[in-house]
């Protein structure tokens, strides 16, 4: 069971990143699915290595003082969502913006029907060029 | 099937990084090989988690305006190469240069004879000290 | 065999990061253990994918000129410790400090009784908020 999905620009104002089965994507079988273009949902309980990579372009003057934060989050059936992993990068002083990349990854127990998704502080800063931003998992 | 190889400084002007089976490297068996010191080639079709880490030292004034980009690329037999993953970091203002690290990783389907390699915008900026720059894969 | 542990602030002056089985941690069975809150120790020989993520907050003026370096290290029985992976990030100019995240990961052969740990140049700069700093492994 494995998946690797590719970032998709979105007009939605949500902080949850959007993904697509496009380009050189992976969706090994129907035991993992991409739901609503925003979350990877698993059917089988078990340990999964889950990862995300986010490249963004920001400028210190044009952004809020808070850093750019990418969060890998879990939504289990009947539970509130929770943060699994987070990474933070201070905005660049480069103009018009400076690109930076964040990588997150870890081993987590998922229940049947659990979903994982990626949240960022400012989706408009995310880079969607080939290979820059992706999300996936593999069952151990 | 797994491999982990270590960066090697090169006098070549190519943008493709060079690797060696040295230090604490891994080469599990002959189903994965390091070819020409530049690419990991697999004999078996399947899903692989492929990763690379690149540490580099650059300075904004001494570098081009474009960021430092590391790309994980795939060359399948009879096909043009393609980008699987990329990460970008804007150059530092630190002098003489500021070190930064990039990590790339994802799950991809590889065909028999497929090769993966790492491309960077400026190989002369890459750090080759112990543990700083490495490349590997594992078959799921 | 898999583990994922969560960073813990420590009053110790050691450069070795401290970890805990808290929050959404993973400890699959007793073939991997967290020892003294500082190292993951395995009982079985084999290939492991080992990873660490460290988020830190630093300022160029308040820090030494040397970059922030995170190292993933190995201690095998009867051997000196050795560096497996390192990542470096130059300090930010943001005030009071600028957050940055480092991710390390690779495939390594571990002997029975081998331990892995994470070393940083300045533990006081490490961010311990939910999900920011973690450490884990999985047996292939």
């Amino acid at each position: 069971i494995a998946a690797h999905v590719i970032s998709e620009a979105s007009s939605k104002t949500t902080s949850v990143l959007q993904w697509a089965e496009k380009g050189y994507y992976t969706m090994s079988n129907n035991l993992v699915t991409l739901e609503n273009g925003k979350q990877l949902t698993v059917k089988r309980q078990g340990l999964y290595y889950i990862y995300a990579q986010v490249t963004f372009c920001s400028n210190r003057e044009a952004s809020s003082q808070a850093p750019f934060i990418a969060s890998l989050c879990l939504k289990s059936p009947g539970r509130f969502e929770r943060i699994l992993l987070r990474a933070a990068n201070t905005h660049s002083s480069a103009k018009p913006c400076g690109q930076q990349s964040i990588h997150l990854g870890g081993v987590f127990e998922l229940q049947p029907g659990a979903s994982v998704f990626v949240n960022v502080t400012d989706p408009s800063q995310v880079s969607h060029g080939t290979g820059f931003t992706s999300f996936g998992l593999l069952k151990l | 099937i797994a491999a982990h190889v270590i960066s090697e400084a090169s006098s070549k002007t190519t943008s493709v990084l060079q690797w060696a089976e040295k230090g604490y490297y891994t080469m599990s068996n002959n189903l994965v090989t390091l070819e020409n010191g530049k690419q990991l080639t697999v004999k078996r079709q399947g899903l692989y988690y492929i990763y690379a880490q690149v540490t580099f030292c650059s300075n904004r004034e001494a570098s081009s305006q474009a960021p430092f980009i590391a790309s994980l690329c795939l060359k399948s037999p009879g096909r043009f190469e393609r980008i699987l993953l990329r990460a970008a970091n804007t150059h530092s203002s630190a002098k003489p240069c500021g070190q930064q690290s990039i990590h790339l990783g994802g799950v991809f389907e590889l065909q028999p004879g497929a090769s993966v390699f790492v491309n960077v915008t400026d190989p002369s900026q890459v750090s080759h000290g112990t543990g700083f720059t490495s490349f590997g894969l594992l078959k799921l | 065999i898999a583990a994922h542990v969560i960073s813990e602030a420590s009053s110790k002056t050691t450069s070795v990061l401290q970890w805990a089985e808290k929050g959404y941690y993973t400890m699959s069975n007793n073939l991997v253990t967290l020892e003294n809150g500082k190292q993951l120790t395995v009982k079985r020989q084999g290939l492991y994918y080992i990873y660490a993520q460290v988020t830190f907050c630093s300022n160029r003026e308040a820090s030494s000129q040397a970059p922030f370096i995170a190292s993933l290290c190995l201690k095998s029985p009867g051997r000196f410790e050795r560096i497996l992976l390192r990542a470096a990030n130059t300090h930010s100019s943001a005030k009071p400090c600028g957050q940055q995240s480092i991710h390390l990961g690779g495939v390594f052969e571990l002997q029975p009784g081998a331990s892995v740990f994470v070393n940083v140049t300045d533990p006081s700069q490490v961010s311990h908020g939910t999900g920011f700093t973690s450490f884990g492994l999985l047996k292939l």
């Epitope: 060029g129 080939t130 | 493709v16 790309s71 690329c73 060359k75 009879g78 096909r79 043009f80 190469e81 393609r82 980008i83 491309n119 | -």
Partner: nanobody, 122 residues
Framework: EVQLLESGGGLVQPGGSLRLSCAAS????????MAWVRQAPGKGLEWVST????????YYADSVKGRFTISRDNSKNTLYLQMNSLRAEDTAVYYC???????????????WGQGTLVTVSS
């Protein structure tokens, strides 16, 4: 809309050099192989050279090998052809073309520029 715009053609003496450029837009340039194809007066189309998406591999017709060099700058979405030691038989309209597939051996193109004329004459 995909656009390929060649420039750099002109009149040159035998043994001289020229550099052709092709500015690309309307597609993700770094994802595609690119080629130069030429058509001599009164003749059919002749493939000249191909470069892979990241510039890792280059391929040349025997007639130009060692004299022509294909290159690309993905940051500028531009393809180049450096032509040295030009001969009268290199006189042609040179077209920039986008490979239609990812297959290296398939010289099939889905988009073409309008061409730039290269005349080699004393």
């Amino acid at each position: 809309e995909v656009q390929l715009l060649e420039s750099g053609g002109g009149l040159v003496q035998p043994g001289g050099s020229l550099r052709l450029s092709c500015a690309a837009s309307g597609f993700t340039f770094e994802e595609y192989g690119m080629a130069w194809v030429r058509q001599a007066p009164g003749k059919g189309l002749e493939w000249v050279s191909t470069i892979s998406p990241l510039g890792i591999s280059t391929y040349y017709a025997d007639s130009v090998k060692g004299r022509f060099t294909i290159s690309r700058d993905n940051s500028k979405n531009t393809l180049y052809l450096q032509m040295n030691s030009l001969r009268a038989e290199d006189t042609a309209v040179y077209y920039c073309a986008k490979h239609a597939t990812s297959q290296e051996s398939l010289r099939s193109f889905d988009y073409w520029g309008q061409g730039t004329l290269v005349t080699v004459s004393s």
